[in-house]
Each structure stands twice: as C-alpha cells, then as structure tokens.
Interface confidence: low
C-alpha cells in the first residue's frame, strides 16, 4: 500500500452576496461585526466547496476581508489535491464547479443558500500560493480596506508605528481602474512596497515592487487592470516618520486605439503613449496605433527614451511589454540608452503598432515619439547604426555604434578629406584661409551653407557651415549670426587632486565651482550660465548626498580654508542628473545644478563656453584641469585651487588601456607616463581647452580613472559634446523655473 501523494493548492478570490450590505464596521477587522460576519461567511464558503466534488479535497479556508458591492467577501481556501489531478484543477475549472453548484437547484437546499444569496456571475477565483497566505497573514494587524469613489483622490493612512507590515486593500467601481500614487518623502529608507493586481498579495499578480526610497522614481503612479488592488508595505528600519505618502483614485479606462496620418516632413510629429502616461501602464493594456505615411519615400521612426525593443522567441513572454510591428513580434525592455525603431515602408496603407502587457508585472508608462525618415538617405551626413536605429557621427574616431561600424572603412578618421586626392588634413586647417589640399578644396564653400555632416556646425536656422568650431571666434560664419550668439563666456578674468599641478591665480579659472556640504568640499563643477553649474552625476550617488538642499556652491573661490571678497555662494534649488547615468559603468556622468539666484558676472566669476555637438577637440591637444582635489592618491584635498595641463588621448588608445569600458560619452586625457591627473575631490570639475580665439571651451568633466596619475591609465572625463543636447534641453526647459 502506498499513500497517495497530495499537493496543497491555494486559491484566492472573491464573491458577491446580493442580500447583504457592506458597512463601515465590516471594513474594520477588529470589529465585532467583522468577526461575526467573517465566521458566517467562512462557514458558507466551506459549505459551498463541500457541495461540489472539491469537498473531498478541502483543507482550510478564510474570509479575510469584506468590501462594497453590495457585499463582497474576499477569501482564500486550500485544497489537498492528488498529484495527478493538480493540473486539471485550474482556477478556471474550480470556478466552473462552484458556479455550477451556485446555479443548481439541488433538492437538499444547502444551508449556505438560505442565508446567503451568492451572485454566480461575480465569483472570482485566482491561483495563489502558501507564501501568498503567509504574506497576507503578516499584514492582518494593519489591514486597511478602502472603497474609492469616482472623482475622489483618497489619501491612504500611513502604516501604524508598531507594525512591520501593512496591506491596503483598494476597491473601486467595477467599470473603473484603480490608480495608486506613491511618493517617497525621504531619500534613504529600506522599506519595501509591493502592488498587486488583485485583492490580496498574490505573487502571480504582482504589478511592481519597490525597495528603499527610490531616487529614480520619487513619485510613481501605478494602474491596476481593473477595480481592485492590494498594496503591501514591509518596514525596513525604524523611523518615526512615514517614508512615503500613498493616495488612490478610480479612473476611467483610457482608449489607446488611434489612427494618425503623418505629414511629409522629417521632424518629430507627435508621440504615442500608454494610458495615463507617465503612470505605470496597466496589466490589461492593449494599444493599437495605426500610422499612415504620405508616401513610400518615407520610413517611420519610433524614438524611445530609456526603453528599447528586441526580437524574442515566440515561446517566451515579454516581461516589459510586447510590441507587434508589421507582424514582427518584439519585446520591450528598459535600458539606460536612447533607441529608435525604424520601420521601412513597403505598403501605402501605413503601419499598425500594437503594444500589449502580457503579464501582471508592468513598468513605467511608455512614450514614443514618431517621425518620418527618408528611406534613401536615413541619416544625412551621418551613419545609421542598425543596432539601435540612431544616426551617429561617422569617422570621428569614436565608436558610437556598439558594433563599431561607424568607424569602419574611413578614408580620413577625425580629419578632413581633400576632394582631389583623398589626402587627409587636420580639421583646424579647414577654412583657415590657407589652402592645404592640392586644389584648395579645404578653402572652398567657406562662406556659404554646406550639407550637414559630422564636423559641420549647425546654425540656428538649421543650415550648416564648413568651418570647424566656428563658435565665438569673433567671425560671423552663419547667415543668421548664431555662431556668435551666447558668447559671454570662456574668457579668463585676469592677464582634484590635481596631481603634478600648480597653484592658480585669482580670476584665472572664473568658471570653477566648489560644491560643498556643511562647509566641506566634495566635488568640483563649472559655471555654464547665470543660474547653472555643471558637474558629475556620481557626486550625488550616495543617498545622503542626493538632496539639492544639502549643497552650497561657491564661485570665485581660491582657498578652501578662507573666504575673500571675490567669492560668492549659492544654494541649489534643483538638481538634474542625466537620466541615463549608470553608477557602475560611469556612463553619462553629468549633472546640472540650478542655483537659487542668478550669478552676477565679475572678473572672478563668469561662465565657460559650452561646445556645439559638432565641436572637435583634437587628440593631442593640450587642455587644462582645475580643482581642489588630493595632490596624491589617497591624500587630503588641497587648500588652494590647483591647475594642470593634460593631453587629449585618442579614444581607441584609452579604450584599450581600460579594456573597452570607455563609452562614446567618455573622453580621456593625461599622459602615458602618468604624473599629471585629476584625483579624489576633483570629480565634476572642468577639463577646458583654449580655442585660437582665446576662449576656453568645456571639453570634459572629471569622472573616473584607475588611481591617480598612474602610468598607462589616463584620466577619464565625461565628453561634453556627447551630452550637450541634454544640457541644452534642461537649460531651455527650466531657465524660467525660478
């Protein structure tokens, strides 16, 4: 004789009782009414199960909550099922058996039917696990039921001080969706908040789980697929104040079935977004966007932000959204890079794009901008990187495309190619009024517009000029004069550890900033506009340094241990970290600080010039770094502002030294023999290069490196030309937000 092997199968669900009404008392687990009604309801549930063939497998059950509508009972029950039958008793099958029983007019009228009129239609049965019940039970000392009426924003009461776990059980009108807003009120905590697309904490219905006070998402809004949601909080460390605020509302289902007709132009024409963007998309999201293109000359480009698409085998679910584009199945995934999906047009009836959430786990709302591109020339003057759909500079010495194809088959790399014989001349010799090419092609078209390319400067009117680095050189090269606008910059006022450096004089580096917390120098920075200082994002990676309120910015400073009349200090009103910054890789290591009031420029305080995206800093060029960093590896910060000259290093040489961990957003400078370098405390400080015009341009920001001044290991800087679009975007959008 062999004992039959059974497995415990847990089911969770809800049922509606038509002849009972919900009362406030039933919403409180500690009330007498709750205890009495839950005991009766549990008996009813037990009898209901016992009346079916599931009765023989019954183990235990619990009615753990009540809700509106007229009275909804939320429950779980466990069946001990023979192993061989486990797969046959799915939640759908169990529901069917229970519904059949509710609809049957059996002669022996079960006692549960006399007292409870259960609505068969409203029966919900979901798969659960023993662990789900454990989690649920751990919250019962702090269980909060709330019914969310339409139109109201309901703030949810924070957790009780003495409890370690709470559950907010949220329910709204059946035809609406629950939307929860979670706002972290502190920057450091170890609390965990999980949201479920069900009345209880069912792992299989998890929408999202956040741990600690999320700096990436200080405020998040999360949608359920329908009118119920459970939010579970687990305490991290003791705190007198709640580290978060919760509120909830019931919102209407938003349609995302759109037909759009694009116009025959190449700029961005609009965006597609998941309902309630930037809220998390709902587990029930299904969007269908049909875009019609004016002619087959064009292809359609979808521009994603921190989200990309890739092919996925059909038998694998997409965990971050499924996309169907022209019958191709793609899976979305979050990434800290830009991405474009290019859709070549083969038929004139346009393209249908479907976005579907395949699982309950969702993520931040997705927004995609759309535009057209010329199918015959998708990237005028640039290279189309097929890996990520982006147009990147070609043959500039930097492998922008992950496969490096933008730097293959180059006749002249980071140089000008003469038309006559394909000889290469250095870029500063182009349009310098000295013919260097055989027939002088380097000096042609210098006074007129040329097709845009990697090294051409784009004027404000979108035309391009051939002369490299024409900004602020005292000559108007653009028809609209835009190359000579915003030129109140880059002039020295007078006349980190900076390893191998020398002391600076007053006004020599008037853009240099000292970023301090409680009187202690932490990082360097550079003034780029009257309310903006640029620095490195990694200066803020510690939770304890993430708040702008902590920081003071000093400009015009010379010595750390004393103040002098030429220096001024500012509080920081806002802090912007590059959205793609990644701590581990140091990529996109840039941040912007908005000062609390405008800077008054003087001989000792004025901004450095920002380079255009096309600005070329030539490898081999001597530039300067400045800061109060340590003067030897592991040493203390310097008292006096130090300066040191460093040489710009070709990208491939640096990439080799650092085993290919150098991204296109990085620039290297230093010397093979080491010695001269930045060090701890110089982070975020400026690497500046002087143009022939005498103006200083910001080439880089001190970012990372192996040690300080070590032979064969150059200093690595954030390459400003590769993040300049983001810088301009922030300055433009927030210059008025005082």
């Amino acid at each position: 004789y062999k004992a039959e092997v059974t497995v415990s199968q847990v089911y969770s669900g809800s049922l509606r009782v038509l002849n009972r009404h919900f009362s406030q008392d039933l919403g409180r687990r500690e009330s007498i009414a709750f205890r009495s009604e839950s005991a009766k309801a549990q008996k009813m549930l037990q009898e209901l199960v016992a009346s079916t063939r599931l009765g023989t497998y019954y183990n235990s059950s619990s009615v753990y909550s009540f809700g509106e509508g007229p009275l909804t009972c939320f429950f779980w029950f466990i069946l001990d099922i023979p192993e061989y039958q486990r797969l046959t008793l799915s939640p759908e099958v169990v529901r069917e058996l229970l519904v059949d029983e509710l609809l049957s007019n059996s002669s022996t009228l079960a006692s549960y039917k006399t007292e409870y009129e259960v609505d068969p239609e409203g029966l919900v049965i979901l798969e659960a696990s023993v662990n789900d019940i454990v989690v649920l039970n751990s919250t019962l000392g702090c269980y909060r039921y709330s019914y969310v009426n339409p139109g109201q924003v309901l703030p949810l009461k924070g957790p009780d001080q003495q409890t370690t776990s709470c559950l907010w059980h949220l329910q709204g009108p059946e035809d609406l969706m629950i939307k929860v807003r979670l706002e972290w009120t502190r920057v450091d905590c170890r609390d965990r908040v999980a949201m479920y697309d069900a009345a209880g904490p069912l792992e299989k219905r998890l929408i999202t789980s956040v741990y600690g006070c999320s700096r990436q998402e200080p405020v998040m809004e999360v949608l359920a697929s329908g009118s119920v949601m459970a939010v579970v909080w687990k305490k991290g460390m003791h705190s007198y104040y709640d580290p978060f605020l919760l509120s909830v509302k019931s919102v209407a289902f938003q349609d995302c079935q759109v037909n759009l007709t694009l116009e025959g132009r190449l700029d961005t024409q609009g965006f597609l977004r998941t309902p309630y963007y930037p809220s998390y998309y709902s587990p029930s999201t299904h969007c269908s966007w049909h875009l019609t293109v004016p002619s087959l000359d064009y292809g359609l480009a979808l521009w994603f932000d921190a989200y990309a698409l890739r092919r996925q085998k059909y038998n694998r679910l997409c965990t971050q959204g499924q996309w169907m584009i022209q019958n191709r199945r793609l899976c979305g995934f979050r990434t800290l890079q830009p991405y474009a999906e290019r859709i070549p047009m083969v038929a004139s009836d346009g393209v249908t794009i479907n976005f579907t959430s395949q699982i309950s786990l969702t993520g931040p709302g997705v927004q995609v901008y759309y535009s057209l591109y010329n199918q015959s020339d998708p990237c005028p003057g640039e290279f189309l990187c097929s890996v990520n759909g982006l147009c990147v500079p070609a043959c500039d010495g930097i492998k922008d495309c992950p496969n490096g194809l933008d730097e293959r088959n180059c006749v002249c790399r980071a140089m000008f190619q003469c038309q006559e014989d394909s000889t290469c001349i250095s870029l500063p010799r182009v349009c310098d009024r000295q013919p260097d090419c055989l027939n002088g092609s380097d000096e042609e078209q210098c006074q007129e517009g040329v097709p845009c390319g990697t090294f051409t400067f784009q004027c404000e009117d979108r035309s391009c000029v051939k002369k490299p680095n024409p900004e602020c050189d005292g000559q108007s090269d653009c028809r609209d004069g835009s190359d000579e606008q915003h030129c109140d910059c880059g002039l020295q006022g007078l006349s980190s550890r900076i390893v191998g450096g020398t002391v600076s004089s007053e006004g020599e580096w008037p853009w240099q900033a000292s970023l301090q917390i409680r009187g202690r120098h932490i990082c360097g920075g550079a003034l780029i506009a009257d309310r903006w200082v640029i620095t490195a994002a990694h200066c803020f990676q510690e939770d304890s340094m993430a708040s702008p309120k902590l920081w003071t910015v000093f400009l015009g400073k010379m010595r750390q241990n004393s103040r002098w009349p030429g220096e001024v200090s500012f509080k920081v009103s806002r802090l912007f970290l590059h959205p793609y910054h990644e701590e581990d890789s140091h990529d996109y290591d840039v941040a912007l600080l908005q000062l609390d009031h405008p800077v008054v420029y003087s001989a000792t305080v004025r901004p450095v010039c920002l380079p255009a995206r096309s600005h070329f800093f030539e490898p081999g060029q001597h530039c300067w770094i400045t800061g109060w960093g340590a003067q030897r590896e592991g040493g203390p910060v310097s008292n006096t502002l130090q300066k040191v000259d460093v040489q710009l290093v070709p990208q491939d040489l640096c990439s080799e030294a650092y085993r290919y961990q150098v991204s296109p957003r990085m620039l290297c400078a230093g010397y093979r023999k080491g010695k001269k370098d930045a060090c701890q405390g110089d982070s975020g400080g400026p690497l500046v290069c002087r143009e022939p015009s005498g103006r200083w341009f910001l080439a880089g920001l001190v970012s990372w490196g192996l040690g300080c001044g070590r032979p064969n290991f150059f200093g690595v800087y954030t390459r400003v030309t590769r993040v300049i679009n983001w810088i301009q975007q922030v300055l433009t959008h927030h210059h008025h937000h005082h």
């Epitope: 609009g270 404000e460 009103s573 433009t732 210059h735 008025h736 005082h738």
Partner: antibody
C-alpha cells in the same frame, strides 16, 4: 469633475491691492502648476505668473514682477493671486488655470472681474 | 518675450466651411503651442496642445499642425457652436504669451 471656482467681482481704487482666490475641486493642486492670466476688455490674454503649490515655487512675468504675488493654501486646495499698486489699466477679468508641468493650461476658472476706478 | 502673431484678425464663414487660422511665433517654440476657444463672457477652453494633440472631449473636426515658428488650426466643417474667438499660446518658455486672437463670425 475638475472645477476651479474663483471669488467674486471687485471694485478697487488706484493704488490699492486686490486678492483673488481660486478654489479647486476634483484634483489636488499640489499635483499641478496653478497659473493666473488676465484679459483686459477687448484685449488678448496675458499670462501673469504661476506657482508650483507643492513647494510654493513661483515664476512671474517680468511685466508683473514686484506687483503680483501668487500663494497656495494646499490644505484648502486653493490658490490666491494678489496684485498691488493698482492702476486703471489693471481693469480686467482675471482667470486662474491649471497645467501639468510643460503642458498648457487645460482647465480655467470662470474669471473674476476687477475694476479699478477712482 | 516670444511674440505670437495670429492671422487673420477676424473672418466670416458659413456652417460647413473649412476654416484655417495661422499663428506665427517670433522664435522657435518647437511644438509647444496650444490653441484655445473663447466665447463671450466665458473662460477659454483648451482645444489643441503640443501643436497637434486634441484635448479630451474636443471634436475631431478641430486639428492642429506646424512646428518651430508656424502653426495652423483647422476646423474641417464649421458647426454653429464653433463661432467664437480663437487664441494661440506658446507653452515653450515663460512668460507664456498669447496671440491677439482671431474672431470667427457667421457670414
């Protein structure tokens, strides 16, 4: 549903100040920017300024800087606009409106007529 | 400040007509442009924002186009309730500025 209800019409003498209130319902003002826009008889709309009630950060039009003050009362879900040193050319209908971040003003109050005359 | 110029200042049209109103910005405002409708004695109502996006509840006969400095509001088939004054507004940078308005009257 979203509603912005403004205080009633005012008659003021030149040099005086006026304070107009804007009570919001159907949404939380802390989630939005609150703007004030005015329209003199037969004239175009003129943006005066805005506030982010979450942190009381204000941005004013240079034309009104120094004369206008916008303040929130988040507990009452209300925004206020005070205009000082009134002159006859300040006679206008004053509107409050809300916006999300960089989007324009999607819902407006019914307007408050302020008449300045001696 | 960014100047906004609308044309025409006024226009007469009949029910069923297709009407176009243009708005020009004195500098590039990308696609940060909104259109409002205002009837006498009423507050403005948002029709279009980000140059082309219809506000919820706005009939599909209203459409917006343009980017940079030149923008257009089109009403494909005029209805009796569309006779009003229309304003454009740049929401690109503060101070936000409005056009002088286009009064649409019944012919």
């Amino acid at each position: 549903q979203v509603q912005l209800v403004q205080s009633g019409a005012e008659v003021k003498k030149p040099g005086a100040s006026v304070k107009v209130s804007c009570k919001a319902s159907g949404f939380n003002i802390e989630d939005y920017y609150m703007h004030w826009v005015r329209q003199a008889p037969g004239q175009r709309l003129e943006w005066m300024g805005r506030i982010d009630p979450e942190d009381a950060e204000t941005t004013y039009s240079p034309k009104f800087q120094g004369r206008v003050t916008i303040i929130p009362d988040t507990s009452a879900n209300t925004a206020y606009m005070e205009l000082s040193s009134l002159r006859s050319e300040d006679t206008a209908v004053y509107y409050c409106a809300r916006s999300i971040y960089l989007d324009p003003m999607d819902y407006w109050g019914q307007g408050t007529l302020v008449t300045v005359s001696s | 400040d960014i100047q906004m110029t609308q044309s025409p200042k006024s226009l007469s049209a009949s029910v069923g007509d297709r009407v176009t109103i243009t708005c020009r910005a004195s500098q590039d405002v990308t696609t940060a442009l909104a259109w409002y409708q205002q009837k006498p004695g009423q507050s403005p109502k948002l029709l279009i924002y980000w140059a082309t996006t219809r506000h919820s509840g706005v009939p599909s006969r209203f459409s917006g186009s343009g980017s940079g400095t030149d923008f257009t509001l089109t009403i494909s088939s005029l209805q009796p309730e569309d006779f009003a004054t229309y304003y454009c507004q740049q929401h690109y940078s503060t101070p936000y500025t409005f056009g002088q308005g286009t009064k649409l009257e019944i012919k």
